[in-house]
């Protein structure tokens, strides 16, 4: 035990951290909505598109009430990590037609990465179980055609939009329990 500490060094309180995580998620949701609209304008979607490698939607808004903080954050982080990988893959293998979505796709990737970092820090501050942020995952196969890349982009942005919408609701609800 030593002398008293020097001036305090202050880092954000978990509740303040949750507030800023909600703001970041909302901002990412707006980005995703805008990018999905941009994609629909350039390449209209013929019906719903899905990609087997994407995570299934965590749950309906109605089921949110029963959720516990660790489960929400763990699931959200796992799903967003999957979407981050898919966005990276889309930028790398999506083909020349999707180059028209840059630099917005790059900004989306950076913000998604930032949100994942924020969630990791929040889980650390709360001392919740922390699955590895970068678990090994099988590589994604390149799209079979240019149209395949566009279909994949529709599926990725659509799924991310639903996930982020669920995330905002979930995080706001969790804030009341912290």
């Amino acid at each position: 035990p030593g002398p008293p500490p020097g001036p305090p060094r202050v880092s954000p309180d978990p509740r303040a951290e949750l507030d800023s995580t909600v703001l970041l998620t909302r901002s990412l949701l707006a980005d995703t909505r805008q990018l999905a609209a941009q994609l629909r304008d350039k390449f209209p979607a013929d019906g719903d598109h899905n990609l087997d490698s994407l995570p299934t939607l965590a749950m309906s808004a109605g089921a949110l009430g029963a959720l516990q903080l660790p489960g929400v954050l763990t699931r959200l982080r796992a799903d967003l990590l999957s979407y981050l990988r898919h966005v990276q893959w889309l930028r790398r293998a999506g083909g020349s037609s999707l180059k028209t979505l840059e630099p917005e796709l790059g900004t989306l990737q950076a913000r998604l990465d930032r949100l994942l970092r924020r969630l990791q820090l929040l889980m650390s501050r709360l001392a919740l179980p922390q699955p590895p942020p970068d678990p090994p995952a099988p590589p994604l196969a390149p799209p079979s055609s240019a149209w395949g890349g566009i279909r994949a982009a529709h599926a990725i942005l659509g799924g991310l939009h639903l996930t982020l919408d669920w995330a905002v609701r979930g995080l706001l609800l969790l804030k009341t329990r912290l």
């Epitope: 970092r117 709360l126 919740l128 179980p129 922390q130």
Partner: antibody, heavy 114, light 111 residues
């Protein structure tokens, strides 16, 4: 201002028990995971145990597993460490710390000696 | 032996820039967990210096910066001052231990 004040340290014989307490103030205690970290004289930092913000998750270093128990009382803003079957190698300054850990107390000295 | 490896000592003259490395493995830094850095001045408790690889808590001068790549991280101190003489520790969560692990510490001497 954030304050973490450890107490309960002292001299104990090998095989004996001690209960450390850490009184927290100046922050929302119930929103933070809490750690115990120790530092043997002249050595580096060694993590001992962590408890989640609501007490539902507890983890321990292998060196103390089965001997030490971490707990918290959010209504009293207090963290505890029950230490049983103490060994000479448990001699250290024990710090309580909050969050990442972001904030640390000044520590309490535990000496295990016959 | 510590799970994270740091050089036991480092030194520099006032005004210089020094870096301290921290090497981990695939169960901690390499698994993607953030690295945090602590400063322990002689006879005092550790203080958080850098969190989440490169974030500074308010009150920490911008002379201190952190970075992370692969399984290692580093702390840089520019414009070295005599009051920076302290022990510096890195830490990261470890999946195999279900808790944070610390480096062995680096004693920084300002010549």
């Amino acid at each position: 201002e954030v304050q973490l004040l450890e107490s309960g340290g002292g001299l104990v014989q090998p095989g004996g028990s001690l209960r450390l307490s850490c009184a927290a103030s100046g922050f929302t205690f119930s929103s933070y995971g809490m750690h115990w970290v120790r530092q043997a004289p002249g050595k580096g930092l060694e993590w001992v145990s962590v408890i989640s913000y609501d007490g539902s998750y507890k983890y321990y270093a292998d060196s103390v597993k089965g001997r030490f128990t971490i707990s918290r009382d959010n209504s009293k803003n207090t963290l505890y460490l029950q230490m049983n079957s103490l060994r000479a190698e448990d001699t250290a300054v024990y710090y309580c710390a909050a969050g990442v850990p972001d904030y640390w107390g000044q520590g309490t000295l535990v000496t295990v000696s016959s | 032996q510590s799970v994270l490896t740091q050089p036991p000592s480092a030194s520099g003259t006032p005004g210089q820039r020094v870096t301290i490395s921290c090497t981990g493995s695939s169960s901690n830094i390499g698994a993607g967990y953030d690295v945090h850095w602590y400063q322990q001045l002689p006879g005092t408790a550790p203080k958080l210096l850098i969190y989440s690889n490169n974030e500074r808590p308010s009150g920490v001068p911008d002379r201190f910066s952190g970075s992370k790549s692969g399984t290692s991280a580093s702390l840089a101190i520019s414009g070295l001052r005599s009051e920076d003489e302290a022990d510096y520790y890195c830490a990261a969560w470890d999946i195999s231990l279900n808790g944070p692990v610390f480096g062995g510490g680096t004693k920084l001497t300002v010549l």
